[in-house]
Interface confidence: medium
């Protein structure tokens, strides 16, 4: 089990004793910093080296723990800030004692399961967010504003990082068609220290549960269990999952017999992955070999291109990537209901994108 909280507590205790029992605060930067502040840089460096040692000992069990990664980066920053050498004496473990009082701020103690609140407090601004979506045939809008139509069949990861795993399973829209549609979505919210137990959400066409696989609707019995929740205003067609502990909102919709996925996620969370987790459609878009050009559409049914354009124009007046995706979907499926998927994806992007100037993407092909 990840012991980062014990490392944090020991570091705070050792720096408090150096400061003569000052007030507590968040761990990052916790000594109040060095020369002239009551904490001699020698004492602080000893405490930081102990903290680093403690994090190294628990590293194996802390992969994907936000508090752990935050602590590691914080230690690094502080050691540089205070010119601490990596080698040298460490602080003795602090005596066990009663819990320390907070600073009496009138606000609750920093909530480790409120990513946005924690980030804002330290950085003086809200965190940066990224948006990714998959809908229709499927069309994927990546975090970096690439917009691809994919021919992917079978299971493909949209996201695969230290906190989240999202997999879409696609199958051909019609016999012999190049285009595919998402029929199943699997989302794994990875276990996170005091916030949530691991939770799995699975949706299939005609089965959008408003609960995780274990029947629960939150993150479990841990102190921060409520920082993961699942809800709907439109049962059977729409599910929203809020994961406040990682600054994330996910929307899953069912339209025209296919599933759409949309996410707004904190930048740091989205980018917390290693080299071996490199295949993620939300990060790199569709692999080049799996991309479909809009010219590759095989029209099915009685819908002409003019009719498709007219149908799509009603809800998507701007001829952007969403509009062109809509035309593609309507033509290839022969189903006018496919207009809804692109419209909903655009609405999600409007709600989720931090920069609305990037709302309308204009594909080059």
């Amino acid at each position: 089990q990840c012991k980062i909280l014990r490392c944090n507590a020991e570091y705070v205790s050792s720096t408090l004793s150096l400061r003569g029992g000052g007030s507590s605060g968040a761990l990052r930067g916790g000594g109040g910093g060095g020369r002239g502040g009551g904490v001699g840089s020698g004492g602080l460096c000893r405490a930081l080296r102990s903290y680093a040692l403690c994090t190294r000992r628990t590293a194996r069990t802390c992969r994907g723990d936000l508090a752990f990664h935050s602590a590691v980066h914080g230690i690094e920053d502080l050691m540089i800030q205070h010119n601490c050498s990596r080698q040298g004496p460490t602080a003795p473990p602090p005596p066990r004692g009663p819990a320390l009082p907070g600073a009496g701020s009138g606000l609750p103690a920093p909530d480790p399961c409120d990513y946005e609140g924690r980030f804002s407090r330290l950085h003086g601004r809200p965190p940066g967010f990224l948006h990714c979506a998959s809908f229709g045939d499927p069309h994927v809008r990546s975090f970096h504003h690439h917009f691809h139509t994919c021919r992917v069949q079978g299971a493909w990861p949209l996201l695969d990082n230290d906190f989240l795993f999202v997999q879409a399973t696609s199958s051909p829209m019609a016999l012999g068609a190049n285009a595919t549609a998402t029929r199943k979505l699997t989302i794994i919210f990875k276990n996170m220290q005091e916030c949530i137990d691991q939770k799995v959400y699975q949706a299939e066409v005609d089965n959008l549960p408003v609960a995780f696989e274990d029947g629960s609707i939150n993150g479990g019995d841990r102190p921060g269990g409520s920082s993961l929740s699942i809800q709907t205003a439109n049962p059977g067609n729409h599910v929203e999952i809020q994961a406040a502990y990682i600054g994330t909102t996910i929307i899953i919709r069912q339209t025209a017999g296919q599933l759409s996925f949309s996410i707004k996620v904190a930048e740091d969370v989205a980018m917390a992955f290693s080299a071996e987790q490199d295949l993620q459609l939300c990060v790199g878009g569709c692999p080049p070999s799996q991309r479909l050009s809009r010219s590759e559409r095989n029209r099915r049914g009685a819908i002409t291109i003019d009719t498709a354009r007219r149908l799509c124009k009603e809800g998507l007046p701007v001829e952007d990537a969403y509009f062109h995706s809509c035309v593609f979907d309507v033509l290839i499926s022969g189903d006018p209901n496919f207009t809804v998927a692109a419209q909903a994806a655009l609405e999600d992007a409007r709600a989720f994108l931090p920069d609305l100037e990037k709302l309308h993407l204009f594909p080059s092909d």
Epitope: G22, S23, S24, G25, A26, L27, R28, G29, G30, G31, G32, G33, D77, Q81, A103, G104, S105, G106, L107, D114, E116, G117, S120, R121, L122, H123, G124, R125, P126, P354, D355, L356
Partner: antibody
Framework: EVQLVESGGGLVQPGGSLRLSCAAS????????MTWVRQAPGKGLEWVSG????????YYADSVKGRFTISRDNSKNTLYLQMNSLRVEDTAIYYC??????????WGQGTLVTVSS | QSVLTQPPSASGTPGQRVTISCSGA????????VNWYQQFPGMAPKLLIY???QRPSGVPDRFSGSKSGTSASLAISGLQSEDEADYYC???????????FGTGTKVTVL
């Protein structure tokens, strides 16, 4: 107990400079972003500048960009606002505030800056 | 110039409910948390509501906040004479990369 005490205000001529300080106590300074907010006589609140807990990130209102500089010394638990090229419209009470939970949860009592010829 | 718009004044008799609106845009209220501050004449502002609807300890539960889309509101139920003050909303603005305050509302208890 959390306390913020501003100092350094006073009367200055247009084009002149002032340096405001805010001494913080009762909390670990480096764990909180800090901001300066001002209030012109009889007017509303205006956010001036903010700085992250480490001091690495700084933010400014357009009205003061290029003239004011925010900084902090966490070893002294002190926040600063260096104000150059002061204008008559910079006349205000300047408050320093601690940022907790994305809000300004503690405020100092303010220091008056008067820019007049 | 304030980016968030509030009515200049609001009033009510003791015991009444008063609501103050705060209208913004997608770059501030629409995408970030809204905070409310109370300021008595000659005093520093005090945090009243944070994160749209959270009350710091010590703030009476007759104060409540809410947010919908690009608008937020502060409600004072059971108005008391000591609630006579100026009230400001505020939020981070993604476009300006800074905080923005509302124009302020003076609440008078009749």
């Amino acid at each position: 107990e959390v306390q913020l005490v501003e100092s350094g205000g006073g009367l200055v001529q247009p084009g002149g400079s002032l340096r405001l300080s805010c001494a913080a106590s009762g909390f670990t300074s480096s764990s909180y972003a800090m901001t300066w907010v001002r209030q012109a006589p009889g007017k509303g609140l205006e956010w001036v500048s903010g700085i992250s807990g480490s001091g690495e990130s700084t933010y400014y209102a357009d009205s003061v960009k290029g003239r004011f500089t925010i900084s902090r010394d966490n070893s002294k638990n002190t926040l600063y606002l260096q104000m150059n090229s002061l204008r008559v419209e910079d006349t205000a009470i300047y408050y320093c505030a601690r940022q907790g939970y994305g809000a300004h949860d503690y405020w100092g009592q303010g220091t008056l800056v008067t820019v007049s010829s | 110039q304030s980016v968030l718009t509030q009515p200049p004044s609001a009033s009510g008799t003791p015991g009444q409910r008063v609501t103050i609106s705060c209208s913004g845009a997608s770059s501030n209220v629409g995408s970030n948390r809204v905070n409310w501050y109370q300021q008595f004449p000659g005093m520093a502002p005090k945090l009243l509501i944070y994160s749209n609807n959270q009350r710091p300890s010590g703030v009476p539960d007759r104060f409540s906040g809410s947010k919908s889309g690009t608008s937020a509101s502060l409600a004072i139920s059971g108005l008391q004479s000591e609630d006579e003050a100026d009230y400001y909303c505020a939020a981070w603005d993604d476009s300006l990369n800074g905080y923005v305050f509302g124009t302020g509302t003076k609440v008078t208890v009749l």
